[in-house]
Interface confidence: low
């Protein structure tokens, strides 16, 4: 229904705390360089204005759209051009073009320092002094670094953060209580970020239809007892929620997500028997819980998929009458039978089925033509299954760090033109798939591995779009979203690449590396490994292992030496010489 004042409506629906959090996220995701204090001031002004509209919906400007109100606020910031350059040109446009312009200027890789966690004592002091400001800083810092983070989910992580601090700051040993818990939240939030970015990419590049197909497959796997009409309704609602969040309409997105959670909990009987535990929780936890609820038990007596989609005499008639509905039911029926497949694989199968019907229904004898379609799915299914087996075997053999290194070598060979920091980030993220997925039961591995890899590769594509350097990467990133992972997997050594000349300074290290945290040490070593591959793209695994072992030994020796600086300056050049010889 239409409301006289949109801002009053959202303030009333969401309540002050969530309203303020979402407005802060929105501003931080649009203007990523502004300080917390600048944004906090704007948020307070917007909140005060919303309250006047709640009191009197007919008050001046209360009837304006949220985009107009927020955009006017952002455009009133002093020194906008100095700080943001051409983003300031957005302010010369009218809505809706102005908001589109802001969206186009979101930076997926802003030049901000990594978000450093203060030490426990300091964190607890500032949390106790002002929990609201402390959590505001958290929202601001995460949102500006992740401009497409799913806003209602970020509120959930802030709530988790809050609960952890409340608990751990009361303990004697704050550090050992906080560190593992906050590391866990950080890891989950980072995965959430890349997954959501993938959804927004799908929406931006291929439109709502593509996202809705993804949602139908995912929901059908999770709720195999829900009928097609129910799945379609949920997919439509979920598409709307994600479209709003990806489009910067965060208040509407959070409000509609709460509505969807409410609907699901009121209609459990026709959706799934697994929802009750989620539905007993408060709002943010409930919506989060529903988004990752375990799959319902599959109905025992589902007929073979062939009956309706291959053997039925009316296949071409049904397809011609309502293509999208027919393909939607195929995707639904196939997905509910295969919780063990990735959504990407299910979408590839649906695409294959569609292409087969397009071709066969134009022929003289369609059933003879499409009769083998299910058999033709086999290679499409085997490929990711083999990928999972090979990679999980490798992970189990090498461990996470070794597995990351293997991936780093592989991807540097595929796309040596890509910057070393991007390759290292991608390989470290891709390598985490082992820890995340390979330990799961067999039937959960494929969906976990492939859908996670797809999300990470989406980030590779986004970073590459900014500075396209590799034809290989451009080729894989230009195709459809679901074909990307197979495309990257199929890439081999880039034969067009002219190897980098050997620069001794790239492999020169100093004693400061000894005091770095383990993660930073790994990144330094992985940077050297990528540079080695760029120098010798066709180096064998054995050669690279020899060099890296030597390098690890050198670091170990010099970091234990009494005079570290002398060790690094004398042994370093010897290491460089040995590396050159080993790779000759």
């Amino acid at each position: 229904e239409a409301h006289k004042s949109e801002i009053a409506h959202r303030y009333n629906d969401l309540g002050e705390q969530h309203f303020k959090g979402l407005v802060l996220i929105a501003f931080s995701q649009y203007l990523q360089k502004c300080s917390y204090d600048e944004h906090a001031k704007l948020v307070q002004e917007v909140t005060d204005f919303a309250k006047t509209c709640v009191a009197d919906e007919s008050a001046a400007n209360c009837d304006k759209s949220l985009h107009t109100l927020f955009g006017d606020k952002l455009c009133a910031i002093p020194n906008l051009r100095e700080n943001y350059g051409e983003l300031a040109d957005c302010c010369t446009k009218q809505e809706p073009e102005r908001n589109e312009c802001f969206l186009q200027h979101k930076d997926d890789n802003p030049s901000l320092p990594p978000f450093e966690r203060p030490e426990a004592e300091a964190m607890c002091t500032s949390f106790k002094e002002n929990p609201t400001t402390f959590m505001g800083h958290y929202l601001h810092e995460v949102a500006r670094r992740h401009p497409y983070f799913y806003a209602p989910e970020l509120l959930y992580y802030a709530e988790q953060y809050n609960e952890i601090l409340t608990q751990c700051c009361a303990e004697a040993d704050k550090e050992s209580c906080l560190t593992p818990k906050l590391d866990g939240v950080k890891e989950k939030a980072l995965v959430s970020s890349v997954r959501q970015r993938m959804k927004c990419s799908s929406m931006q590049k291929f439109g709502e239809r593509a996202f809705k197909a993804w949602a139908v497959a995912r929901l059908s796997q999770t709720f195999p007892n829900a009928d097609f009409a129910e799945i379609t309704k949920l997919a439509t609602d979920l598409t709307k929620v994600n479209k709003e969040c990806c489009h910067g309409d965060l208040l509407e997105c959070a409000d509609d997500r709460a509505e969807l959670a409410k609907y699901m909990c009121e209609n459990q009987a026709t959706i799934s028997s697994k929802l009750q535990t989620c539905c007993d929780k408060p709002l943010l936890k409930k919506a989060h819980c529903l988004s990752e609820v375990e799959h319902d038990t599959m109905p025992a007596d589902l007929p073979a998929i062939a009956a309706d989609f291959v053997e039925d005499q009316e296949v071409c008639k049904n397809y011609a009458e309502a293509k999208d509905v027919f393909l939607g039911t195929f995707l639904y029926e196939y997905s509910r039978r295969h919780p063990d497949y990735s959504v990407s694989l299910l979408l590839r199968l649906a695409k294959k089925y569609e292409a087969t019907l397009e071709k066969c229904c134009a022929e003289a004898n369609p059933p003879a033509c499409y009769g083998t379609v299910l058999a033709e799915f086999q290679p499409l299914v085997e490929e990711p299954k083999n990928l999972v087996k090979t990679n999980c075997d490798l992970y189990e053999k090498l461990g996470e760090y070794g597995f990351q290194n293997a991936i780093l070598v592989r991807y540097t060979q595929k796309a040596p033109q890509v910057s070393t920091p991007t390759l290292v980030e991608a390989a470290r993220n891709l390598g985490r798939v082992g820890t995340k997925c390979c330990t799961l039961p067999e039937d959960q591995r494929l969906p976990c591995v492939e859908d996670y890899l797809s999300a990470i590769l989406n980030r590779v594509c986004l970073l590459h779009e900014k500075t396209p350097v590799s034809e290989h990467v451009t080729k894989c990133c230009s195709g459809s979203l679901v074909e990307r992972r197979p495309c990257f997997s199929a890439l081999t050594v880039d034969e067009t690449y002219v190897p980098k000349e050997f620069k001794a300074e790239t492999f020169t290290f100093h004693s400061d590396i000894c005091t770095l945290p383990e993660k930073e040490k790994q990144i330094k070593k992985q940077t050297a490994l990528a540079e080695l591959v760029k120098h010798k793209p066709k180096a064998t695994a054995e050669q690279l292992k020899t060099v890296m072992d030597d390098f690890a030994q050198f670091l170990d020796t010099c970091c234990k030496a009494a005079d570290k600086d002398t060790c690094f300056s004398t042994e370093g050049p010897n290491l460089v010489t040995r590396c050159k010889d080993a790779l000759a």
């Epitope: 007892n225 009928d227 009987a269 026709t270 799934s272 038990t297 109905p299 007596d301 589902l302």
Partner: nanobody
């Protein structure tokens, strides 16, 4: 082809009881949540009750809570609605539907009147 047939409706006095039955065929009944919906004269459709595929989860509209009981027999492909303490406002055509779908059957008339 999916078919649902309701029976068991009739005329009953306020405070009386009825048991509605829905017979299903043409689909894997045991795989689907089912609902009862009703339409009073001149009104829109109103959801009454729902039950999950395995009967583990049952839901009721506030207006019928404590008076109506939904149940099913998957082996017989039957859905039931036990209605007690009937009131005049329960007068309507009752339909069984798959999930939360729209009625695709004739329904059965329930009239509560003295």
């Amino acid at each position: 082809q999916v078919q649902l047939a309701e029976s068991g409706g009739g005329l009953v006095q306020p405070g009386g009881s009825l048991r509605l039955t829905c017979t299903a065929s043409g689909f894997t009944f045991g795989s689907f949540g089912m609902s009862w919906v009703r339409q009073a004269p001149g009104e829109g459709l109103e959801w009454v009750s729902a039950i999950s595929a395995d009967s583990s989860d049952k839901r009721y509209a506030d207006s019928v809570k404590g008076r109506f009981t939904i149940s099913r027999d998957n082996a017989k492909k039957m859905l039931y609605l036990e209605m007690n303490s009937l009131k005049s406002e329960d007068t309507a055509v009752y339909y069984c539907v798959i999930g939360r779908g729209s009625p695709a059957s004739q329904g059965t008339q329930v009239t509560v009147s003295s």
